[in-house]
Amino acid sequence: MSGLGRSRRGGRSRVDQEERFPQGLWTGVAMRSCPEEQYWDPLLGTCMSCKTICNHQSQRTCAAFCRSLSCRKEQGKFYDHLLRDCISCASICGQHPKQCAYFCENKLRSPVNLPPELRRQRSGEVENNSDNSGRYQGLEHRGSEASPALPGLKLSADQVALVYST
């Protein structure tokens, strides 16, 4: 046993008392030692919330989390965890994930604001050559295994939770 020393440079039950920190929620990123929304603090020797540093230093392990946090602050946008990109809900209304439900449903109530292809869809026209056609198909299942970014890609329950977390 030792310690740090001279620097050359300047009433509950036993079960209730015991706190568990299960090692779950690990992402597939390079065998991380901390969950995705946390970073390793080498001085404290523990995982800390990325939220505390998003506005300050650049911490590469928090880059995706901080991007998703700032994206969520922007109205009408959501963060796609698979694409690791901030997506505008306006571009995918009609085939949108639940994160865009509020935005898109409000949009649909005022057709004047809709892009032409969606106005045609509402009036019964079919648009076969839309760039967004099928891009988010399967999302109406809300929590199905389908990936919002990659149709047909099967995800584990953990990955689904991650993709749909807001």
Epitope: S7, E19, W40, T46
Partner: antibody
């Protein structure tokens, strides 16, 4: 005086589980993370993971995921590590250590775990 | 993971002489102006003891004959003058990235 007192040696059968303890004293328990390190006979040291009584942060070596679970009892300033599905590969001395300012400055005396039928 | 390579694997030095152990990291362990490299001494049947932390700072109760140097990826532990009690295994360990990793160890003996 800072002390980390570990539970005694364990002789267990393959496939069984074992829970070893590390009772701390002499400092404010919530101010430091407690880490666990494995040392197989005559070999180097391997970090298993840590547990922070303060913020619940639990850094963990993916190699030991599914093998080790760390828990803490704040009321007794004790940290536990449970090892499950034991095999001969898990026979080793396991140390707990207090982490501060980027280093493990105080260590427990070690707990020997022997897996044998 | 950051890999730490220690050299030599074993070392025999005469009493009163200088013992130098090296540790090379696979990537820099510098962190905001400090190097997160630590050195431990271990004697048979005992837990590791922190002798140097953050590359060049002495652990509590560690004699002044122990010193550490280096930054980035290359680090050294020096013991001078060597005493009988200094025999044992020495390990370097980095804290910068998780998982923290250890070197393979250097066995120090008296010649």
């Amino acid at each position: 005086e800072v002390q980390l007192q570990q539970s005694g040696p364990e002789l267990v059968k393959p496939g069984a589980s074992v829970k070893i303890s590390c009772k701390t004293s002499g400092y404010t328990f919530t101010e430091s993370t407690i880490h666990w390190v494995k040392q197989s006979h005559g070999k180097s040291l391997e970090w298993i993971g840590g547990i922070s009584p303060n913020n619940g942060g639990s850094p963990f070596n993916q190699k030991f995921k599914g093998k080790a679970t760390l828990t803490v009892d704040k009321s007794s300033s004790t940290v536990y590590m449970e090892l499950r599905s034991l095999s001969s590969e898990d026979s080793a001395v396991y140390y707990c250590a207090k982490w501060v300012r980027g280093a493990m400055d105080f260590w427990g005396q070690g707990t020997s775990v022997t897996v044998s039928s | 993971d950051i890999v730490l390579t220690q050299s030599p694997a074993s070392l025999a030095v005469s009493l009163g002489q200088r013992a130098t152990i090296s540790c090379r990291a696979s990537e820099s362990v510098d962190y905001y102006g400090m190097s997160l490299m630590n050195w431990f001494q271990q004697k048979p049947g005992q837990p590791p003891k922190l002798v140097i932390y953050a590359a060049s700072n002495q652990g509590s109760g560690v004699p002044a004959r122990f010193s550490g140097s280096g930054s980035g990826t290359d680090f050294r532990l020096n013991i001078h003058p060597l005493e009988e009690d200094d025999t044992g295994m020495y390990f370097c360990q980095q804290s910068k990235e998780a998982p923290p990793t250890f070197g393979g160890g250097t066995k120090l003996e008296i010649k």
